[in-house]
Interface confidence: medium
């Protein structure tokens, strides 16, 4: 019999809302597992600290990732 | 189930440094997106935040006590520690530890210890 | 001093619906999110309301939150003996760039 594990996954709330990359101080995206079922991408904002957690579905958190890698591309040797 | 424990001394002398630990379980701080923060309430005053890290070992400090306060954390013990320097009467109070997750704010604490009152006194 | 303002104590008679206040200022509960925090006698703090009007699981619909310009709100309905406690309010202040509370209501139920 499999061991019952507590789902934990991080986030409380997410946000659709747009984010601006100027803004951001850090990205994560936390891949599913077996402690939580779905993608968290946790986003850092300069601001307060304030650690965010965006919708992966919605068209305006994938346009920042995309906005992300390609700044991140540039700067890579 | 998420708990979280503050333990350090009661009585300490001015001019001393207090260290307190929490001990939390339940989450790990080895997760991203998880913080622990430090809280006082000196008697019959308001809540006041002292400190706050987080998984990626970030560290916070109330601006106007940040020359005063050290925090870290031990992820294998479940730990978090802050260290107060050079206390005095005012310090007296409780002191909370409380755990922050992402996406809620960052000031929403969704877990509490119970307090541990510290005394600064000669 | 507090940077947010709340009543010192409240009372109602159980059923009863109240209200306790938190007034603040532009650089917080004007410009950010409201939160409560409810601590019974001998326990732990715990969270009651987050983000203005939300309640995290396990916290009856009997408690609701609201915010109105530069004030906060919570309202206790169909008071119960067992919500005799103090009552926080938290919100972040852009000039202090901090966390800020309410001084905290002492709730009687009588």
């Known amino acids: 019999v499999p061991l019952s594990r507590t789902v934990r996954c991080t986030c409380i709330s997410i946000s659709n809302q747009p984010v601006n990359p100027r803004s951001l101080e850090k990205l994560e995206i936390i891949p599913a597992s077996q402690f939580c079922p779905r993608v968290e991408i946790i986003a850092t904002m300069k601001k307060k600290g304030e650690k965010r957690c965006l919708n992966p579905e919605s068209k305006a958190i994938k346009n920042l990732l995309k906005a992300v890698s390609k700044e991140r591309s540039k700067r890579s040797p | 189930q998420v708990t979280l424990r503050e333990s350090g001394p009661a009585l300490v002398k001015p001019t001393q440094t207090l260290t307190l630990t929490c001990t939390f379980s339940?989450?790990?701080?080895?997760?991203?997106?998880?913080?622990v923060i430090w809280i006082r309430q000196p008697p019959g005053k308001a809540l006041e935040w002292l400190a706050r890290?987080?998984?990626?070992?970030?560290?916070h400090y109330n601006t106007s006590l940040k020359t005063r306060l050290a925090i870290s954390k031990d992820t294998s013990k479940n730990q978090v520690v802050l260290t107060m320097t050079n206390m005095d009467p005012v310090d007296t109070g409780t002191y909370y530890c409380?755990?922050?997750?992402?996406?809620?704010?960052?000031?929403?604490?969704?877990?509490w210890g119970q307090g541990t009152t510290v005394t600064v006194s000669s | 001093q507090s940077v947010l303002t709340q009543p010192p104590s409240a009372s109602g008679t159980p059923g009863q619906r109240v209200t306790i206040s938190c007034s603040g200022s532009?650089?917080?509960?004007?410009?950010?999110?409201v939160n409560w925090y409810q601590r019974l006698p001998g326990a732990a703090p715990q969270l009651l309301i987050y983000?203005?009007?939300q309640r995290p699981s396990g916290i009856p619909d009997r408690f609701s939150g609201s915010k109105s310009g530069t004030s906060g709100s919570l309202v206790i309905s169909g008071l119960q003996s067992e919500d005799e406690a103090d009552y926080y309010c938290a919100s972040w202040d852009d000039s202090l760039n901090g966390r800020v509370f309410g001084g905290g209501t002492k709730l009687t139920v009588l």
């Open positions: 409380a755990r922050l997750r992402a996406g809620s704010g960052p000031y929403v604490f969704d877990s």
């Open positions: 339940g989450f790990s701080l080895t997760t991203s997106g998880m913080s």
């Open positions: 983000n203005n009007d």
């Open positions: 890290i987080d998984s990626d070992d970030e560290k």
């Open positions: 532009s650089s917080n509960i004007g410009s950010n999110t």
